[in-house]
């Protein structure tokens, strides 16, 4: 061989929503006269080199990864070695290596970034009745089943950030999705609006919740 096969993958991570299908793109440049009988293609987890999917001995050897992967057989001869990953899970996140061997061999790694949008936050107050200016209340903002971990921001009705007396906890469920609970302790003014913003840093998706307290009674804005 005069030079090793060049394997190309996207530089940027592939972002996939939980439950959807993702395509991990990989390509190589077949030489004139190339046939699939010459191709040995391995998709593997980069970190461990564990087999994910393979095409060897002229045929698709199938998925070694929970039967959720597939190649694009009609496109292989043109040098398209992309892998389809079905029903993406949080646990799929990471680096996948596309290893191509013809007369020589080469590899390239592509990153899969998994994401899930956060639900619209629900807001609760404690105590939630007979509130008067000067009372200390805890406002809890809860948003569910997102990934990766959220960034949470609080602000008042004038848009001024509220950073003190905020406690945020995030817990992963069995699927790896996060439920976020952020608690703001605040001394009530005569009236006021308190907003929480839950941001998914990968999707750049913001979910907003707010509560308005006007002496008595207090009101929650209608759900959007």
């Amino acid at each position: 061989p005069t030079g090793a096969v060049e394997v190309q993958v996207p530089e940027d991570p592939v972002v996939a929503l939980v439950g959807t299908d993702a395509t991990l793109r990989c390509s190589f440049s077949p030489e004139p006269g190339f046939s699939l009988a010459q191709l040995n293609l391995i998709w593997q987890l980069t970190d461990t080199k564990q087999l994910v999917h393979s095409f060897t001995e002229g045929r698709d050897q199938g998925s070694a990864y929970a039967n959720r992967t597939a190649l694009f057989p009609d496109l292989l001869a043109q040098g398209n070695a992309s892998l389809r990953l079905q029903r993406v899970r949080v646990a799929d996140e990471g680096s996948f290596t596309c290893f191509v061997s013809i007369r020589d061999f080469g590899s390239a790694a592509v990153s899969l970034q998994v994401a899930a949008p956060y639900s619209k936050p629900s807001m609760t107050l404690e105590p939630n009745k007979d509130l008067r200016p000067g009372d200390t209340v805890t406002i809890t903002c809860s948003s569910y089943r997102g990934y990766p971990e959220a960034e949470v921001f609080w602000q008042d009705g004038q848009g001024v950030p509220l950073t003190g007396n905020v406690t945020t906890s995030q817990m992963a469920n069995e699927q790896g999705l996060f439920d976020v609970h952020s608690v703001l302790r605040v001394v009530l003014g005569a009236n006021g609006t308190y907003s929480c913003l839950v941001r998914n840093p990968v999707l750049q998706q913001d979910a907003h919740g707010s509560v308005t307290i006007t002496g008595q009674p207090m009101t929650f804005p209608p759900e959007a």
Partner: antibody, heavy 124, light 109 residues
Framework: QVQLVQSGAEVKKPGSSVKVSCKAS????????INWVRQAPGQGLEWMGG????????NYAQKFQGRVTITADESTSTAYMELSSLRSDDTAVYYC?????????????????WGQGTTVTVSS | DIQMTQEPSLTTSPGGTVTLTCRSS?????????ANWVQEKPGQAPRGLIG???KRAPGTPARFSGSLIGGKAALTITGVQPEDEAIYFC?????????FGGGTKLEIK
């Protein structure tokens, strides 16, 4: 425990060729690449090229392109490295080292097993 | 050409902890470079210690660990033993070739 056993020392004339063998004892080449690495006296390690015996595909370092030929016989679990047009600066110890292509155990140990080395002396 | 930089020499004491690093001229080292660490002692063949960034080869003592630190591959020896005196080479995979670093000579004083 797999061992890589290499052929014995060689003394060669400038311009000639040398062929070094590397046999997997107590195991096979399955799922492995065999790399060839050399070390000149007082120098570091230098990768020359590698072969995946199960697919007979070979890569060479650009520096050795056209002068080195790496082959493998899967039936005997033996890899070979032939270096031609020898010069005095090819005097070195030549090693083979295996490296996993696919980690069947789910753990990638890298270049975990090395041959004992073959000393090649090029002298007129 | 890809250049890889290792500390030419390091000195440590028995029982101490030492970290050897391997920097690549191409940028940050990642898991796809499959960083390997190889130990060489005088008169002996090289011995693979670490593969795939952080996987100890069978027979490698637990005091050896591999990692990525600040964009470099790193080998940490915790509780250095006198027999750890050797030259340590890193090797990185670049798509279709291996490149070795120049080696770090580790002295135990």
């Amino acid at each position: 425990q797999v061992q890589l056993v290499q052929s014995g020392a060689e003394v060669k004339k400038p311009g000639s060729s040398v062929k070094v063998s590397c046999k997997a004892s107590g195991g096979t080449f399955s799922n492995y690449a065999i790399n060839w690495v050399r070390q000149a006296p007082g120098q570091g390690l230098e990768w020359m090229g590698g072969i995946i015996p199960m697919w007979q595909s070979v890569n060479y370092a650009q520096k050795f392109q056209g002068r080195v030929t790496i082959t493998a016989d899967e039936s005997t679990s033996t890899a070979y490295m032939e270096l031609s047009s020898l010069r005095s600066d090819d005097t070195a110890v030549y090693y083979c080292a295996r490296d996993q292509v696919v980690a069947t155990s789910g753990v990638n140990f890298g270049m975990d097993v090395w041959g004992q080395g073959t000393t090649v002396t090029v002298s007129s | 050409d890809i250049q890889m930089t290792q500390e030419p020499s390091l000195t440590t004491s028995p029982g101490g902890t030492v970290t050897l690093t391997c920097r690549s001229s191409t940028g940050a080292v990642t898991t796809s470079n499959y960083a390997n660490w190889v130990q060489e002692k005088p008169g002996q063949a090289p011995r693979g210690l670490i593969g795939g960034t952080n996987k100890r080869a069978p027979g490698t003592p637990a005091r050896f660990s591999g990692s990525l630190i600040g964009g470099k591959a790193a080998l940490t020896i915790t509780g250095v033993q006198p027999e750890d005196e050797a030259i340590y080479f890193c090797a990185l995979w670049y798509s279709n070739l291996w490149v070795f670093g120049g080696g770090t000579k580790l002295e135990i004083k």
